[in-house]
Interface confidence: low
């Protein structure tokens, strides 16, 4: 509030002109910058008359209050004028002129002092910044305000930004109030339009195309963003998208492979782990179909070694002794060595084997060499009693005490020396490379069991004690037909998939009969020389409970997923896949279909390239390839029979095979008994 009356004499009490609140007339919105309306005299001529009367009555002569009343013709003005008039008189008629002259804003003479009293606009009561004009009135004044000001003395700035009838002053963004005015402005990233009120977004991406470097520029209101694909973050310095190394952030429980734009977690399948549903943590590959893995030490397992003898015995007996072997035998295998006996100097030998499921005997000594196969097929998974006995002029072979072969021989099988018959007997294999000596070559590997053996009529003494100590020589109590993969190893085959007569050039026709014991594992894989896996058939636990998915993959990409099959059952499941460079077909217990999608053609092209080079075929898992080579890396656990391009794969014919894989026997499903 401005103090008025600054021109009053220093020794005089200054009167403050204060408009009582009761007399204040607050302006409407529309009148905000207009004058305060007051009553005033209608005729300006009268004003001039009043000035003349005042000169005559009160300056040329002294006047009393009543005379002054006649000049003003109203009380308010008279009441206002007269005390001030007296002050003027005092100043100029009592020798105070000098003092008055010295005071600030003092009037030079009585005339000017008195004349100034009725002029309400002198000294100026209005706010200098806000008023446009001041009009004198009867003991009052009227300040006319400039636009943007209000109040009796135009002392209040109008805040146009807060005007409810014109929200935000009509500005689209920022309204800045200023004394007596206002102006609109824009936020960063916007420009003002010509109407000085509205703002328009600046498209920084168009203005400066290189603003984000190699990243994608995205204009947003008032700004811009440099966008990177998922798995990348923007580097302000280099103005480029940089791969986020999620692996450095310990995203994965076990193994992590970072790649441009992402990462993949892996679990060590070979140690029995699989990726959990969160795709980060690992969980144990659990058994979905428990198997009866009970073994008995009284049962000798013939396939303990993939290559080599399972048991070696040496006999030194009186020369009258003849060769004799009795045992119970059980197998589903069709070919392999049961036992091989030879003289100390290797000159004479006898082979008891299985070929085509039937007993075969090959013998060679100084007198003869013979081969005979006969009897019924005994690779039926049942216990068959077999006896091979050297008689005086023949060798008699009996199955279930029935003579099935009678092989004539001119002399003793093994020649005694120094009054002793020395014989070495090897179970389930040859002691060395004897293939060239055989009359007819044979695959020596035999997945079978023997029990109740009696060799050279010496009973089982001494042998059981050897076997008892070695768990891996013990045979399963119950087995079924099939091949068993225990989830700890693989078998490797060399198969030529190229078919020169076919237009496709190569084809992979796979038939699988499976009875898995765990819901996750690689069943079949083709592996390239560069440690990639151009094709794999794997099993994974499905998201739906108690079911499994079958994944067909090319390298680490799943090209097809057969969902929610109930494979963990005591019944075998039959699956067929046919792949060539043009298409993929499959047949499962639920459907027979040809798969065709755009991405498949790209993946088949990758497979085609690999198939033109050399690939190794693996069953039951993967060799040492990177974890990221395939979607699944766990070993398959369960029973599985594989037919590729019309050939039933015999694990005995594999290039290599883990000893724990059973080529021709599969543990029975564990049946919950009442007692357990």
């Amino acid at each position: 509030m401005r103090v008025l009356g600054g021109r009053c004499g220093a020794l005089l009490a200054c009167l403050l002109l204060v408009l009582p609140v009761s007399e204040a007339n607050f302006l409407s919105k529309q009148q905000a910058s207009q004058v305060l309306v007051r009553k005033r005299r209608a005729n300006s001529l009268l004003e001039e008359t009043k000035q003349g009367n005042l000169e005559r009555e009160c300056i040329e002569e002294l006047c009393n209050k009543e005379e002054a009343r006649e000049v003003f013709e109203n009380d308010p003005e008279t009441d206002y004028f007269y005390p001030k008039y007296l002050v003027c008189l005092r100043s100029f008629q009592t020798g105070l002129f000098t003092a008055a002259r010295q005071s600030t804003n003092a009037y030079p003479d009585l005339r000017s002092c008195v004349n100034a009293i009725p002029d309400q606009c002198s000294p100026l009561p209005c706010n200098e910044d806000g008023y446009m004009s001041c009009k004198d009135g009867k003991a009052s004044f009227t300040c006319t305000c400039k636009p943007g000001w209000q109040g009796e003395k135009c002392e209040f700035d109008i805040n146009e930004c807060k005007d409810p009838s014109n929200i935000n002053g009509g500005c689209s963004q920022i309204c800045d109030n200023t004394p007596g005015s206002y102006h609109c402005s824009c936020k960063n990233g916007f420009v003002m339009l010509s109407n000085k009120k509205d703002c328009k977004d600046v498209d920084e991406c168009s203005l400066k195309p290189s603003i984000c470097g190699t990243a994608v520029c995205k204009n947003i209101p008032g700004d811009f963003e440099c966008e990177c694909p998922e798995g990348y973050r923007y580097n302000l310095k280099s103005k480029s998208c940089e791969d986020i190394d999620e692996c450095s952030e310990n995203m994965c429980a076990q193994l992590c492979v970072n790649y441009p734009g992402g990462y993949t977690c892996y679990c060590d399948g070979k140690k029995g782990f699989k990726l959990a549903q969160d795709q980060k943590s690992c969980e144990v590959v659990s058994v979905c179909l428990p198997l009866n893995l009970d073994t008995k030490y009284e049962l000798l397992y013939l396939a303990e070694q993939f290559a080599g003898v399972v048991l070696y015995l040496k006999f030194r007996l009186p020369e009258i002794s003849r060769f004799s072997a009795e045992f119970d035998f059980r197998t589903y295998d069709s070919e392999g060595v049961i036992l091989y006996a030879e003289s100390i100097d290797h000159s004479a030998w006898l082979l008891i084997a299985l070929r085509g499921g039937k007993i075969e005997v090959q013998l060679k000594n100084e007198h003869t060499s013979k081969i005979t196969t006969g009897g019924d097929v005994i690779n039926n998974g049942l216990w068959n009693m077999v006896s091979v006995e050297e008689l005086e002029h023949s060798i008699s072979i009996k199955i279930a005490k029935e003579a099935v072969m009678d092989i004539n021989k001119p002399g003793p099988l093994f020649k005694p020396e120094n009054g002793l018959l020395e014989t070495k007997v090897y179970f389930a294999g040859f002691p060395r490379k004897v293939e060239s000596e055989l009359i007819k070559p044979i695959n020596p590997r035999l997945d079978g069991c023997i029990r109740s053996w009696n060799l050279m009529k010496q009973g089982a003494s001494g042998i059981k004690e050897i076997i008892q100590e070695k768990q891996n020589k013990h045979c399963l109590v119950t087995v079924e037909k099939g091949s068993y993969y225990p989830g700890s190893g693989i078998a490797q085959f060399h198969i030529d998939y190229n078919n020169v007569s076919s237009a496709e050039g190569w084809h992979v026709n796979v038939t699988l009969n499976i009875r898995p014991s765990t819901g996750t594992g690689v069943m079949l894989a083709l592996v390239s020389g560069n440690n990639t896996v151009p094709f794999a058939v794997s099993l994974v636990d499905s998201t739906s409970e108690k079911s499994q998915d079958i994944l067909l993959s090319v390298e680490n990409t799943v090209i097809y997923r057969i969902q929610a099959l109930s494979l963990c059952s005591d019944q075998q499941s039959h699956l067929e896949f046919r792949v060539n460079r043009n298409n993929l077909e499959l047949s499962t217990p639920l459907k027979i279909e040809t798969i065709s999608h755009e991405d498949l053609q790209r993946q088949l092209a990758v497979l085609d390239k690999a198939m033109k080079a050399k690939v190794a075929t693996y069953l039951g898992g993967l060799p040492d390839v990177p974890f990221s080579a395939t979607p699944v890396n766990a070993f398959y656990n369960g029973c599985m029979e594989v037919n590729i391009n019309g050939v039933q794969l015999d694990l005995d014919e594999a290039i290599s095979k883990h000893n724990d894989i059973r080529a021709h026997s599969c543990p029975s499903v564990w049946k919950k008994t009442k007692n357990s």
Epitope: N580, N583, I592, G646
Partner: antibody
Framework: QVHLKESGPGLVAPSQNLSITCTVS????????VSWVRQPPGKGLEWLGM???????DYNSTLKSRLSISKDNSKSQVFLKMNSLQIDDTARYYC?????????WGQGTSVTVSS | QIVLTQSPAIMSASPGEKVTITCSAT?????MHWFQQKPGTSPKLWIF???NLASGVPPRFSGSGSGTSYSLTISRMEAEDAATYYC?????????FGGGTKLEIK
Amino acid sequence: QVHLKESGPGLVAPSQNLSITCTVSGFSLTGYGVSWVRQPPGKGLEWLGMIWGDGTTDYNSTLKSRLSISKDNSKSQVFLKMNSLQIDDTARYYCARDPGAMDYWGQGTSVTVSS
Amino acid sequence: QIVLTQSPAIMSASPGEKVTITCSATSSVTYMHWFQQKPGTSPKLWIFSTSNLASGVPPRFSGSGSGTSYSLTISRMEAEDAATYYCQQRSSYPPTFGGGTKLEIK
């Protein structure tokens, strides 16, 4: 959809040869095998042989010496040829798509061996 | 070759009656397929791989078995089920069919 149709001579004289064509649609002969089966009047079914998608063939051992199966992938046709027909070769001859189980059959063509 | 023997050769059943057709093999087989044939029409794949119903086959049909003994069962006979049913093995070459079982409605 899958469709197979056999076309044959109908009547064949004894000791003469038989040729039947099976024209297929709705699937590719490179991806599926086709089997041939015959059925004498009022009797059961007998599998004759098949040709696989890759062109390899399998024959019933009892007829192997007289039988030949071939195909033309581009024309979607499979051919059965049988030599030296006898009276007991009179039957209805069917072709069937065979992805491990004969899931689609033609309507068959009747062959009568008679002089 | 494996010989498949179907029994019975001919049988009739009343509507709603349970029907079982058996197929016996001379050697063990892995799977058995079944075909339905009605007079004047081609055979149709009815059950494949022992127990899987071909598309369009009513759920009243089921298949089971293992080794040398297999069967096809209709839980409740209906008039439309009257036909000849053949079993077929593919485990050993050549594939062979059973002699067929003619099922009639009473």
